[in-house]
């Protein structure tokens, strides 16, 4: 991953913080929030993007070359945006216009665009859809996707908070 211009860390921090709040509002838990289950193993997790040690999102990794981490976050945002665009969220039960889900979708797009280099090729993914006999699964899938997104965004927000605090170019005072 070549070194390229850094993002606007402060803006990313603000947007990611807002996204965390929207994801929470879109799927506020009744009771204790258990983002990641302790019994999950690697095999069951491999279809969900996670920010891991080797992604360079730790303070030292960000200092050395933040592009590795930003690429991982970009991939995760694209993955979740793709799911929010799918039949899982478009079908019944219908989501109200201007609902937290709609705002979440818009903000997710905003952060993606902020991180998306102009020349970055867009990956094409198969759009998941539910057959008529699977319609009942929709609320369960929505719940799982939003829980997973909450966990992803919580880590991404910490990355951007660290970047905003330590990697932002200081303003040079003019004489």
């Amino acid at each position: 991953v070549p070194r390229s211009s850094s993002p606007d860390w402060a803006q990313c921090q603000q947007l990611s913080r807002n996204l965390c709040m929207l994801a929470w509002n879109a799927h506020a838990p009744a009771g204790h929030m258990n983002l990641l289950r302790e019994e999950e193993d690697e095999e069951t997790k491999n279809n969900v993007p996670r920010i891991q040690c080797e992604d360079g999102c730790d303070p030292q990794g960000l200092k050395d070359n933040s592009q590795f981490c930003l690429q991982r976050i970009r991939q995760g945002l694209a993955f979740y945006k793709h799911l929010l665009d799918s039949d899982i969220f478009k079908g019944e039960p219908a989501l109200l216009p201007d609902s937290p889900m709609e705002q979440l979708h818009t903000s997710l797009l905003g952060l993606s665009q902020l991180l998306q280099p102009e020349d970055h090729p867009r990956e094409t993914q198969q759009m998941p859809s539910l057959s008529s006999s699977q319609q009942w699964q929709r609320p369960l899938l929505r719940s799982k996707i939003l829980r997973s997104l909450q966990a992803f965004l919580a880590i991404a927000a910490r990355v951007f908070a660290h970047g905003a605090a330590t990697l932002t170019e200081p303003l040079v005072p003019t004489a």
Epitope: A30, N47, P139, S143, R147
Partner: nanobody, 121 residues
Framework: EVQLVESGGGLVQAGGSLRLSCAAS????????MGWFRQAPGKEREFVAT????????YYADSVKGRFTISRDNAKNVVYLQMNNLKPEDTAVYYC??????????????WGQGTQVTVSS
Amino acid sequence: EVQLVESGGGLVQAGGSLRLSCAASGRSISSYAMGWFRQAPGKEREFVATITWSGGSTYYADSVKGRFTISRDNAKNVVYLQMNNLKPEDTAVYYCAADLSSGLDVDFGSWGQGTQVTVSS
């Protein structure tokens, strides 16, 4: 592993009510989506109702909408199915199931033994 035991079934007149319970043991079900399914004699098992892990979202088969209500008490590790205005066509063995999949898919991998509900006309 989660063990599920259904109870509350029985014989009831059309128009009557029953409340089914599904008690879980072996592990807390608070992280899992839960569902009720049923199987009538000579028919395939069919979906009745589901509830998300938090209880924040429920979904029903068209045939039971407005008559059945699914709920859960995570503190007690129990899921309920309140069945009102029962019809003869509701006669079936009712099964409780837990979605144990930790990926972004739905997989009801843990099932109870079922409880018989018979509605007479």
